[in-house]
């Protein structure tokens, strides 16, 4: 069953997904979709990367981390209850039936009414947006040859630990690793 993640209305939700490129610049296409991963591709695509850059994204959906190092975790800005549901992170490893598919369940809770708003963590301060991950940064100049020559060594995704978007700083320590090969 899919791993569950939580965020409050008005927060930024964080859905973790990682892989390890075999070498710098040897990126693998990734897609994020709303809904469980289908047999092929992603349904209802909200963001997609190619071998060089983020080549498609929709409003409120962006990559926060360094996707060129394999951090393809999805951030959803200012979530509402309608953002609840299952999301698919698909790491599109070249070759037949090689894709790694991860279904992540996002549960949106009503915003808490708190008398001390200063005690709330500023999520976006902890994770400032990187414009380069939204398709406006410099493109990789390396030209990939045959895609199947990419030798992925690892696919990583968070397994069980993250239960609230405000724990995102602890994200890296919670990852389960899947080896390809």
């Amino acid at each position: 069953s899919e791993v569950e993640y939580r965020a409050e209305v008005g927060q930024n939700a964080y859905l973790p997904c990682f892989y390890t490129p075999a070498a710098p610049g040897n990126l693998v296409p990734v897609c994020w979709g709303k809904g469980a991963c289908p047999v092929f591709e992603c349904g209802n695509v909200v963001l997609r990367t190619d071998e060089r850059d983020v080549n498609y994204w929709t409003s409120r959906y962006w990559l926060n981390g360094d996707f060129r190092k394999g951090d393809v975790s999805l951030t959803i800005e200012n979530v509402t209850l309608a953002d609840s549901g299952i999301y698919c992170c698909r790491i599109q490893i070249p070759g037949i039936m090689n894709d790694e598919k991860f279904n992540l369940k996002l549960v949106i809770k009503p915003a808490k009414v708190t008398p001390a708003p200063t005690r709330q963590r500023d999520f976006t301060a902890a994770f400032p947006r990187m414009l380069t991950t939204r398709g406006h940064g410099p493109a990789e100049t390396q030209t990939l040859g045959s895609l199947p020559d990419i030798n992925l060594t690892q696919i990583s995704t968070l397994a069980n630990e993250l239960r609230d978007s405000r724990l995102a700083n602890d994200l890296r320590d919670s990852g389960a690793t899947i080896r390809i090969g």
């Epitope: 469980a36 047999v39 092929f40 591709e41 070249p94």
Partner: antibody
């Protein structure tokens, strides 16, 4: 208007070969996965094969693997199904369809009859 | 493979009435399910995808619901042109599979 037109069906003996063609129009062919789905006479639908846009990946149902080959030609906006070592159970109407997971639209179909 | 079972095999309904068609998956397919309509001698036509999203040009009287293993196609007020065979199809698990179909006939 999006349109798919199949051709190449006919009567063939067991063990024989046929090549089906599907001509696409009304959309950017190179941007889409294309699929073949078949329907035996009076029976239900069975997904047969599909090809990823650009042709880098091709997938087949087990019953045709090693006998059928799907291919595409972006210059001709066409997808093909080469069928070898045909068997009686391959008798069906073969439909070409756009899409990888769900299929829309479909061509009108072409009948393949495998019989001696 | 994921077996898709449709019920009933034949459904007799009068024009203007509601028709409810069922589709059950042998394992979860989440919401990765489509519905098609096929009239005699014609190719199938996509009605619904993602379990509940109507395809382009499909009238609002067609609606889909369900997730996991249980799905329903509802036609709220049957028109004469709606009498046909209906197929469900899952695209969550390999390989893609269809149900055996439900024939909707005039009562």
């Amino acid at each position: 208007e999006v349109q798919l037109v199949e051709s190449g069906g006919g009567l063939v003996q067991p063990g024989g070969s046929l090549r089906l063609s599907c001509a696409a129009s009304g959309f950017t062919f190179s941007s889409y996965w294309m699929s073949w789905v078949r329907q035996a006479p009076g029976k239900g639908l069975e997904w047969v094969a599909n090809i990823k846009r650009g042709g880098s990946e091709r997938y087949y149902v087990d019953s045709v693997k090693g006998r059928f080959t799907i291919s595409g030609d972006n210059a001709k906006n066409s997808v093909y199904l080469q069928m070898n070592s045909l068997r009686a159970e391959d008798t069906a109407v073969y439909y070409c369809a756009r899409g990888s997971n769900w299929f829309d639209p479909w061509g009108q179909g072409t009948l393949v009859t495998v019989s001696s | 493979e994921t077996v898709m079972t449709q019920s009933p095999a034949i459904l007799s309904v009068s024009p203007g009435e509601r028709a409810t068609l069922s589709c059950r998956a042998s394992q979860s397919v989440y919401s990765n399910l489509a519905w098609y309509q096929q009239k005699l001698g014609q190719a199938p036509r996509l009605l619904i995808y993602d379990a509940s999203t109507r395809a382009t040009g499909i009238p609002a009287r067609f609606s889909g619901s369900g997730s996991g293993t249980e799905f329903t196609l509802t036609i709220s007020s049957l028109q004469s042109e709606d009498f046909a065979v209906y197929y469900c199809q899952q695209y969550n698990n390999w390989p893609i599979t269809f149900g055996q179909g439900t024939r909707l006939e005039i009562k």
